[in-house]
């Protein structure tokens, strides 16, 4: 009976999400393997988040709006492990917008989701950021490693969206 009611709840939750995400990929987790954590298909998952790489070339503001429409934000990178996971799926000759910007050019960097900007957990390439006119951040491959660079916000780039996993 308990299992039946849990299944019914799950199905109704799935139907609720179906209007936003036509297809979800879910995995069982939790100590009794009773919880399902889901990401929209074909997003990838890492820890408690889902990631989508957009190959559409757009400005930073349009890229963020595009993520927002999908219930996400441009990616906020919190750890080196998270960055290493994300970069596995990136092309080394491309650049991708992050959810990091400095709109006034005062070198006051801010994450789109209001996560505090911690200088000690940043992965800028050597010598970056280097221009107050370059107010948006990308991740790209340079000098044999992935890192961040400040660029003009209006210049179209690919982007990475991030959202919390859906639990059902």
């Amino acid at each position: 009976n308990f299992m039946y009611s849990k299944t019914v709840k799950r199905l109704s939750k799935l139907q609720e999400y179906q209007q936003y995400y036509p297809s979800l990929t879910c995995v069982m987790e939790g100590k009794d393997m009773e919880d399902w954590s889901c990401c929209p298909t074909p997003w990838t998952s890492f820890q408690s988040s889902c990631y989508f790489i957009s190959t559409v070339m757009q400005s930073w503001t349009k890229s963020q709006n595009n993520c927002s429409v999908m219930g996400a934000d441009l990616v906020v990178i919190n750890t080196k492990e998270e960055q290493d996971f994300i970069t596995q799926n990136l092309k080394i000759n491309s650049a991708y917008f992050l959810g990091l910007s400095d709109p006034k050019g005062w070198r006051h960097w801010q994450w789109v989701d209001q996560t505090p900007y911690n200088k000690n957990v940043t992965f800028w390439h050597s010598g970056e950021p280097n221009s107050p006119d370059e107010r948006c951040a990308i991740i790209n491959f340079r000098s044999e490693e992935w890192g961040w660079n400040d660029v003009h916000c209006h210049v179209p780039q690919k982007s990475i969206c991030k959202m919390k996993k859906i639990y059902i």
Epitope: K62, S101, P103, D133, R135, C153
Partner: antibody, heavy 121, light 111 residues
Framework: EVQLVESGGGLVKPGGSLRLSCAAS????????MSWVRQAPGKGLEWVST????????YYPDSVKGRFTISRDNAKNSLYLQMNSLRAEDTAVYYC??????????????WGQGTTVTVSS | DIVLTQSPDSLAVSLGERATINCRAS??????????MHWYQQKPGQPPKLLIY???NLESGVPDRFSGSGSETDFTLTISPLQAEDVAVYFC?????????FGGGTKVEIK
């Protein structure tokens, strides 16, 4: 006082080439992105090309891509526009303009007086 | 590309009265509190001159009879009271995304 002075315009036959120059003074030229904007006779403004302050970034509309090249010489405080394979529809006054960044975008705060390019056989 | 449509194409206003020019973008040129539309004035035989940046900020040295407002896709330039020296063509411009684009212009004359 900020000054932008364009030169190099003139009459050229279709298929010909011209090189426009813009001499900048009164500001630290190397710190600013610059653009060329044109205005056909009796028409509106059309952006032609942009170059970033350190010249790492250049951008063109499809209408001139592959024919026009923007460049700069920060040591000479000069901006250039090399125009090849000119067409009748390139006839316009060409302005150089200084870019100022504002939040996620930019505007043009100073413009030169313009130089006239006429493409005609 | 973002298309900017200005209206009207021209308008005649009496001296001392209010002139209102509209600019509509084909998609939003705002992001949160940043409204990324700018306005220029061009008098015959002269280059454009910046009047307003960021939808509502008056450029230094521009008389305060010029004002701008708007957000997202709809923006307005207002001149009040109109003076004889305001006879010109006015252009809106966006650069939130390359390529930067201009409106087609609005010619302001004295009635």
């Amino acid at each position: 006082e900020v000054q932008l002075v364009e030169s190099g315009g003139g009459l050229v036959k279709p298929g010909g080439s011209l090189r426009l120059s813009c001499a900048a003074s009164g500001f630290t030229f190397s710190s600013y992105g610059m653009s060329w904007v044109r205005q056909a006779p009796g028409k509106g403004l059309e952006w032609v090309s942009t170059i970033s302050s350190g010249d790492s970034y250049t951008y063109y509309p499809d209408s001139v891509k592959g024919r026009f090249t923007i460049s700069r010489d920060n040591a000479k405080n000069s901006l250039y526009l090399q125009m090849n394979s000119l067409r009748a529809e390139d006839t316009a006054v060409y302005y150089c303009a200084r870019q100022i960044y504002y939040d996620y975008a930019y505007y043009f705060d100073f413009w030169g007086q313009g130089t006239t390019v006429t493409v005609s056989s | 590309d973002i298309v900017l449509t200005q209206s009207p194409d021209s308008l005649a206003v009496s001296l001392g009265e209010r002139a209102t020019i509209n600019c509509r973008a084909s998609e939003s040129v705002s992001f949160r509190t940043s409204h990324l539309m700018h306005w220029y004035q061009q008098k015959p035989g002269q280059p454009p001159k910046l009047l307003i940046y960021g939808a509502s900020n008056l450029e230094s040295g521009v008389p305060d009879r010029f004002s701008g407002s708007g957000s997202e896709t709809d923006f307005t330039l207002t001149i009040s009271p109109l003076q004889a020296e305001d006879v010109a063509v006015y252009f809106c411009q966006q650069s939130i995304e390359d390529p930067p684009t201009f409106g087609g212009g609005t010619k302001v004359e004295i009635k």
